[in-house]
């Protein structure tokens, strides 16, 4: 039985050109995490394998950095990065757990609305 739950950073609004950290945490299970995939709209961004370590997809190498931990750092954000991101935890013996984070990337002009941009 799958007892675990995924906690995420929560949805994030960030400014174009900035960077953000996407993180998920699997709790309430003793299952072993064998691999974590990070995906966006059916595109694989990165894989963190328990044995082989990190692999960043070639098309994202310039803007995606591994970590912290099992998280992912997205840099030089563009408006086209707006969308839903998935952390997919492959575990044994439980199976697969998925977390969802929506990232909204805003043009700088939106600052006049008083939005608190999140750039670490």
């Amino acid at each position: 039985m799958m007892t675990g739950t995924i906690e995420t950073t929560g949805n994030i609004s960030a400014e174009k050109g900035g960077s953000i950290i996407l993180q998920c945490h699997l709790s309430s299970t003793t299952a072993q995490v064998t691999q974590v995939n990070w995906e966006q709209q059916d595109q694989l961004l990165a894989i963190c394998n328990a044995d082989l370590g990190w692999h960043i997809s070639p098309s994202f190498k310039d803007r995606v950095a591994p970590g912290p931990g099992l998280g992912l750092t997205l840099q030089s954000l563009t408006v086209n990065d707006t969308g839903e991101y998935f952390c997919i935890y492959h575990t044994y013996p439980d199976g697969t757990y998925t977390g969802r984070i929506f990232l909204e990337v805003l043009e700088s002009s939106v600052a006049e609305h008083g939005a608190r941009f999140q750039i670490p």
Partner: antibody, heavy 119, light 112 residues
Framework: EVQLQQSGPELVKPGASMKISCKAS????????MNWVKQSHEKNLEWIGL????????SYNQKFKGKATLTVDKSSSTAYMELLSLTSEDSAVYYC????????????WGQGTSVTVSS | DVVVTQTPLSLPVSFGDQVSISCRSS???????????LSWYLHKPGQSPQLLIY???NRFSGVPDRFSGSGSGTDFTLKISTIKPEDLGMYYC?????????FGGGTKLEIK
């Protein structure tokens, strides 16, 4: 002035599919995400999902995955929601609502489209 | 999914009253950057819902200052300081911090 003009009421038969339109005006259509919300007869509101008109990216409430399909036509600044394999449970008022940039809220709403599923 | 619980379900009022509506979530609505995406809406009969408050406590454009929002974490409150006839209707809170976005069950503000 921001306006979201939805298509008119629909009476459809069980098992059929239908598409609701939401024409946006008064702002740059690709600059805000578009949400869709269901209001059932019990009066509760449910978030169906959203679409980003800039790149067509979507995010769905899992409850509505396979039931609703969200699309946009940038050339006419129109968002669409197709409802599939309709049953009486889908009888409701459906709203499109513009995302309020930076706050994950909805700042402007369409007038609503009433959908009745009946044989 | 995050469960959002609104109380009370019904709120009988007299014009001029001050009232509070509570909204509680099953997990914290603060994201990892400290931002909380909690908004409030008024749905009047025959109209579309309208945004009142966003980001816990910010009044949307044109919303009278008799409406105020407060709270943090999992516990949020909408206050209306002096009830007027145009305030009657259904009030909903919405959390947009976690996918999927979820609404509270609504509070009906009606005349006593």
């Amino acid at each position: 002035e921001v306006q979201l003009q939805q298509s008119g009421p629909e009476l459809v038969k069980p098992g059929a599919s239908m598409k609701i339109s939401c024409k946006a005006s008064g702002y740059s259509f690709t600059g805000n995400i578009m949400n869709w919300v269901k209001q059932s007869h019990e009066k509760n509101l449910e978030w169906i999902g959203l679409i980003n008109p800039y790149n067509g990216g979507t995010s769905y409430n899992q409850k509505f995955k396979g039931k609703a399909t969200l699309t946009v036509d940038k050339s006419s600044s129109t968002a669409y929601m197709e409802l599939l394999s309709l049953t009486s449970e889908d009888s409701a008022v459906y709203y499109c609502a513009r995302g309020f940039r930076g706050y994950f809220a909805m700042d402007y709403w369409g007038q609503g489209t009433s959908v009745t599923v009946s044989s | 999914d995050v469960v959002v619980t609104q109380t009370p379900l019904s709120l009988p009022v007299s014009f001029g009253d001050q009232v509070s509506i509570s909204c509680r979530s099953s997990q914290s609505l603060a994201n990892s950057y400290g931002n909380t995406y909690l908004s409030w809406y008024l749905h009047k009969p025959g109209q579309s819902p309208q945004l009142l408050i966003y980001g816990i406590s910010n009044r949307f454009s044109g919303v009278p200052d008799r409406f105020s929002g407060s709270g943090s974490g999992t516990d949020f409150t909408l206050k209306i300081s002096t009830i007027k006839p145009e305030d009657l209707g259904m009030y909903y809170c919405l959390q947009g911090t976690h996918q999927p976005w979820t609404f509270g069950g609504g509070t009906k503000l009606e005349i006593k």
